[in-house]
């Protein structure tokens, strides 16, 4: 695959992965309720997030509240929400680095410097990955934790939400797209043959004498 | 030994705040969930509040919420329950409880709490 | 809430005999993720805090005599103390941890 497929695909990747990770970000389903026993008859379900905590009625009727003070937040929830907006910026900055050094943009002149700037961008996306990786993973491990204690109430146990899936989904687009883009840049510096079209000269028009010029032939 | 000492305990006007603590000694505190749990007089036991091993989750009773605030020290090995706008049937016996799985296996000798104008 | 009921509230028996103290709950206990049944009794004495007897229903708690027995399943549960003896006499409750809030027994009062 030539590296311009390569880049095209993997900045695909990475903006549908950055969609994602925004979309996991903002919503309030990092953890539900854990209905354990057909003793807890409860006529709500809980959803928490990096944000807001919503109670969802057996009705369908949803009420979210934002919450007041980041003070009185648990430690995991603001370093989940500083590496997760982090990582969203980090990924904005990675889009305007890739395309800066794309192929098919004028922002830097062909050539080496055009690669390790494609190159460059790459890696922002994957160290946005991991970015966002390590939130969605030691929040992971509290809910499981948690899950599993004895000492924490029924009624108070929680399961993984939808947005730590969409979490992880989007950091594995993140990072096999950022792959890909350096992948695509490594292509640029050591087969520059793969990189941009090749060039061919128009042959020659035919002589008076009707004769074509022999260098025209391999 | 396991121990644990309540104080902060005494007399105190409706409407007003008292904090009381609990040193513990003889277990790794911060290995367990810890609780209060009060007693009127001539009355049952009943559960105030609980907390986890590091303080990041509480629990209350209906009757505190909103205005009692169990919270820990692990390094100075302390249990805490703010309590603010008490009330006269806030006047109890307040016992500092060991918690592991949800029940109560040691408990300190408890210190009065009496709301009174 | 899981409303505790306990009986009887108050109880005379003599030195050597058998007590039995019932407990209800409003709800099952048995909490089907570990398959136990949350409930504990404790004992306290006149003027002392309370001494935890028994928990998961029948598991008796380190140092406590084996006269002191714990069982039932579900809903309804019994103390059943085999033989009485003089430093036995004090209040017993039994107790919920199935979920919060957590939730005591009136208490059954013993006396010689």
């Known amino acids: 695959m030539g590296s311009a497929a390569l880049e095209i695909l993997g900045l695909v990747l990475c903006l549908v992965g950055w969609g994602g990770l925004i979309l996991a970000c903002g919503l309030p389903m990092w953890q539900v309720t854990a209905f354990l026993d057909h003793n807890i008859v409860t006529a709500q379900t809980t959803w928490k997030g990096l944000w807001m905590s919503c109670v969802v009625q057996s009705t369908g009727h949803m009420q979210c509240k934002v919450y007041d003070s980041v003070l009185a937040l648990s430690t995991e929830v603001q370093a989940a929400r500083a590496l997760t907006v982090g990582a969203v910026l980090l990924a904005f900055v990675a889009l305007f680095v890739t395309l800066a050094g794309a192929q098919c943009t004028t922002c830097v002149a062909p050539g080496p410097a055009k690669a390790r700037v494609a190159l460059t961008g790459g890696v922002l996306y994957l160290l946005c990955g991991l970015l966002a990786l390590v939130p969605l993973c030691w929040f992971a491990n509290i809910v499981v934790r948690e899950f599993y204690d004895p000492s924490v109430p029924v009624s108070q146990k929680y399961e993984l939400g939808a947005a730590l899936y969409i979490g992880w989904a989007a950091t594995a687009l993140l990072m096999v797209g950022g792959g890909l883009l350096c992948c695509g840049a490594w292509v640029c510096t050591s087969r520059p043959d793969l990189s941009f079209p090749v060039k061919y000269s128009a042959p020659r028009r035919p002589t008076a004498t009707g004769d074509y010029d022999k260098k025209n032939y391999v | 030994e396991v121990q644990l000492v309540e104080s902060g305990g005494g007399l105190v006007q409706p409407g007003r705040s008292m904090k009381l603590s609990c040193a513990v000694s003889g277990f790794t505190f911060s290995d367990y969930y810890m609780a209060w749990v009060r007693q009127a007089p001539k009355k049952g036991l009943e559960w105030v509040a609980s907390?986890?091993?590091?303080?990041?989750?509480?629990y209350y009773g209906d009757s505190v919420k909103g205005r009692f605030t169990i919270s820990r020290d692990n390094a100075k090995n302390t249990l805490y329950l703010q309590m603010n706008s008490l009330r006269s049937e806030d006047t109890a016996t307040y016992y500092c409880?060991?918690?592991?799985?949800?029940?109560?296996?040691?408990w300190g000798p408890g210190t009065m709490v009496t709301v009174s104008s | 809430d899981i409303v505790m009921t306990q009986s009887p509230s108050s109880l005379a028996v003599s030195a050597g005999e058998t007590v039995t103290i019932n407990c209800k709950s409003s709800q099952s206990l048995l909490f089907s993720g570990d398959q136990e049944n949350h409930l504990a009794w404790y004992q306290q004495k006149a003027g002392q805090s309370a001494k935890l007897l028994i928990y998961?229903?029948?598991t008796r708690e380190s140092g406590v005599p084996d006269r002191f027995i714990g069982s039932g399943s579900g809903a309804d549960f019994t103390l059943t103390i085999s033989s009485m003896q003089a430093e036995d006499r004090a209040t017993y409750y039994c107790?919920?941890?199935?979920?919060?809030?957590?939730?005591f027994g009136a208490g059954t009062k013993l006396e010689l």
């Open positions: 409880a060991r918690h592991p799985r949800r029940y109560f296996d040691f």
């Open positions: 907390i986890s091993y590091e303080g990041r989750n509480t």
């Open positions: 998961w229903a029948s």
């Open positions: 107790q919920q941890n199935y979920d919060i809030p957590y939730t």
